[in-house]
């Protein structure tokens, strides 16, 4: 049988990108990070 036409099978999962800045104390400046899907990646 021929195949019914479908897409590639790879699904795109939309995730929220959250940029954040956190003050860590008077002399240490700030941490700037990027969180993707709940995981800090930068």
């Amino acid at each position: 049988d021929a195949e019914f036409r479908h897409d590639s099978g790879y699904e795109v999962h939309h995730q929220k990108l959250v940029f954040f800045a956190e003050d860590v104390g008077s002399n240490k400046g700030a941490i700037i990070g990027l969180m993707v899907g709940g995981v800090v990646i930068a």
Epitope: D1, A2, E3, F4, R5, H6, D7, G9, E11
Partner: antibody
Framework: QVTLKESGPGILQSSQTLSLTCSFS??????????VSWIRQPSGKGLEWLAH???????LYNPSLKSRLTISKDASRNQVFLKITSVDTADSATYYC??????????????WGQGTSVTVSS | DVLMTQTPLSLPVSLGDQASISCRSS???????????LEWYLQKSGQSPKLLIY???NRFSGVPDRFSGSGSGTDFTLKISRVEAEDLGIYYC?????????FGGGTKLEIK
Amino acid sequence: QVTLKESGPGILQSSQTLSLTCSFSGFSLTTSGMGVSWIRQPSGKGLEWLAHIYWDDVSLYNPSLKSRLTISKDASRNQVFLKITSVDTADSATYYCVRRRIITVVDAMDYWGQGTSVTVSS
Amino acid sequence: DVLMTQTPLSLPVSLGDQASISCRSSQSIVHSNGNTYLEWYLQKSGQSPKLLIYKVSNRFSGVPDRFSGSGSGTDFTLKISRVEAEDLGIYYCCQGSRVPPTFGGGTKLEIK
């Protein structure tokens, strides 16, 4: 919301051509991956897939009926059509039009029309 | 064509019972893209069929979590954990991987 509605002649004679129309709303047949199938169900029996048309005009047919079927669309009017030539009493059934979009997580026949009943008299 | 065989033909249950319906395909329905397009539909009396489960085990929007699908290759199962009155009707499995898409013969879920 997504709705589909089938219309047809109700009753016709053997050897005539059956023409069915599916009018839909809530989606567009110009959207990538979108498609509409025709499925029929004789009274008290199971479901038989007939044909499918995609957004890009590619069409698929049930091989056992292919020589008698023609599916087409008018995307600007949100309509899909099915023609069945040389009908016989075995073509008496409720005919459904059904949406299926292939470029999506829910790749299945997610919305069905209410069906239109067709009786072929000999 | 891919033959879809459903068992049982009729399934008498008491409300609150678990129900299990089997669907077997005559050949593998794994698509070349890696997905298995096995779906379950419920047709209540006088109504059109409605989608319950797609791609073997995914519940469609609004479908209660008492419905679950499982299986692989050629052997698939629909389970209803606690049958309610609104679940009565005819259940159809369907494969959408090959042309033509084909349906099982149906399983009628009815009150014992």
